[in-house]
């Protein structure tokens, strides 16, 4: 006899990185017929939702109108069908951004390189932080962690055309409180084709969409959205 239901998916809309004082919605997708959803924050019960009618709803939303550092942390959700509870979802790392200062991102040897060149990103922030995060925009939402007193180096090694795209960095005051984003740096990697700067592989966005940290323009299946969010969050951990 089944003791638990499959775990639900959890994700944040528009994104798990939320500028302070902005709104965010935590979504939890379980099964049709679930009579109760519980959202847990840092291991404690945070909110409860009872969908009506349960047989027509398989997703609930928990709205946070005003993001701040107290709301940043690890969230998970569970749901119940009858008396049977689900496994807990994966952990959602909700990050508050636009805290304090703006780092400077630069790239060596320059923003236009040839496939095979050794490329290093430098993220610098003069205020009290020792952890830095480098993010590549796009559906796969790559995140790298680096350390240093005022600057972190992110060596990409010899690059390929898969590295092309737009990068930003953050200073991290703790795992869930990040600085403003740096200005973007677009890395153009030319392959073996004569004088061709290839366009980014991952879909990227008009610059203004980064303002709300939308790393994808398409929601697609909610499951997909959740999965790529988890990819980034797991890298953070």
């Amino acid at each position: 006899q089944q003791q638990t239901l499959p775990k639900p998916f959890i994700w944040a809309e528009p994104h798990f990185m939320v500028p302070k004082e902005k709104q965010v919605t935590i979504c939890c997708q379980g099964n049709y017929g679930a009579v109760e959803y519980q959202l847990h924050f840092e291991g404690s019960l945070f909110a409860v939702d009872r969908p009506k009618p349960p047989e027509r709803i398989n997703k609930v939303q928990f709205y946070i109108p005003d993001m701040n550092s107290r709301m940043a942390g690890q969230y998970s959700c569970i749901y119940r069908v009858g008396e049977l509870w689900s496994e807990p979802s994966n952990l959602l790392d909700l990050v508050v951004t636009e805290m304090y200062d703006t780092p400077t991102l630069s790239v060596h040897p320059g923003p236009e390189v040839i496939s095979g060149e050794k490329v290093t990103f430098y993220c610098r922030l003069d205020t009290a932080t020792s952890m830095f995060l480098l993010l590549k925009e796009g559906r796969s939402s790559h995140v790298q962690r680096g350390y240093g007193k005022v600057q972190a180096e992110f060596p990409l090694g010899p690059v390929t055309t898969a590295h092309r795209g737009t990068y930003r960095c953050f200073g991290s005051y703790n795992n869930h409180a990040w600085s403003f984003p740096s200005e973007p740096v677009k890395l153009l990697v030319t392959g073996d084709i004569e004088n061709t700067s290839l366009a980014p592989e991952d879909p990227t966005f008009p610059a203004d969409t980064w303002g709300t940290y939308l790393l994808t323009t398409e929601t697609g299946l909610q499951k997909d959205h959740a999965l790529w969010d988890h990819t980034a969050q797991n890298l953070l951990r």
Epitope: L105, S106, G110, P111, I114, G116, Y122, R124, Q151
Partner: antibody, heavy 117, light 107 residues
Framework: QVQLVQSGAEVKKPGASVKVSCKAS????????MHWVKQAPGQGLEWIGE????????NYNEKFKRRATMTVDKSISTAYMELSRLRSDDTAVYYC??????????WGQGTLVTVSS | DIQMTQSPSSLSASVGDRVTITCRAS??????LNWFQQKPGKAPKLLIY???RLHSGVPSRFSGSGSGTDYTFTISSLQPEDIATYFC?????????FGGGTKLEIK
């Protein structure tokens, strides 16, 4: 268009210091590393080092590390290279250069530094 | 540091001649090899980057080839305005290093 305009020729005594400037225009100054290259009379080219105008980061050729200092003033898009404790073999033309695409594709006109007692 | 050995150090040729200059690196530079032209009293000018790619605006009579440690620069048909000194430069590892130069003269 991209331009790197360097300061004028200098005559210095041994032991003195010289500071060469390179005023950049026509591109985003803070995005591209500024390189400095030495060319002694009738000789080849020697890379002194590079500076990242965006954050002040530097890479030096070991040979010049103790006596060369590269700095920038972002507010006026100008890079500087100071050479201290000058000797006669520092007599050379000093160039600033940037790599806008895949190699050092823009160069200043050069600054002749003569070290003579 | 990677040593770049360029040969010959000087070369005399006639207009229309095919001219070849070689550059040998002390270790593999993975094709990150550039060629510069310098005329008297002027700054160096980039001609070829990444072994064989022509910089914008450079005439097609200039070409480059090679791999590993051995590289070649060729002028297919020498023109009077090509009289200059030519330098190779490796960009694979810091510090970038230059060859000693080849001074090209007209016969």
């Amino acid at each position: 268009q991209v331009q790197l305009v360097q300061s004028g020729a200098e005559v210095k005594k041994p032991g003195a210091s010289v500071k060469v400037s390179c005023k950049a225009s026509g591109y985003t100054f803070t995005t591209y590393w500024m390189h400095w290259v030495k060319q002694a009379p009738g000789q080849g080219l020697e890379w002194i080092g590079e500076i990242n105008p965006g954050n002040g980061g530097t890479n030096y050729n070991e040979k010049f590390k103790r006596r060369a200092t590269m700095t920038v003033d972002k507010s006026i898009s100008t890079a500087y290279m100071e050479l201290s404790r000058l000797r006669s073999d520092d007599t050379a033309v000093y160039y600033c250069a940037i790599r806008l695409r895949f190699a050092l594709d823009y160069w200043g006109q050069g600054t002749l530094v003569t070290v003579s007692s | 540091d990677i040593q770049m050995t360029q040969s010959p150090s000087s070369l005399s040729a006639s207009v229309g001649d095919r001219v070849t200059i070689t550059c040998r690196a002390s270790q593999d530079v993975r094709n990150f090899l550039n060629w510069f032209q310098q005329k008297p009293g002027k700054a160096p000018k980039l001609l070829i980057y990444f072994t064989s790619r022509l910089h914008s605006g450079v005439p097609s009579r200039f070409s480059g080839s090679g791999s590993g440690t051995d590289y070649t620069f060729t002028i297919s048909s020498l023109q009077p305005e090509d009289i200059a000194t030519y330098f190779c430069q490796q960009g694979n590892t810091l510090p970038p290093t230059f060859g000693g130069g080849t001074k090209l003269e007209i016969k």
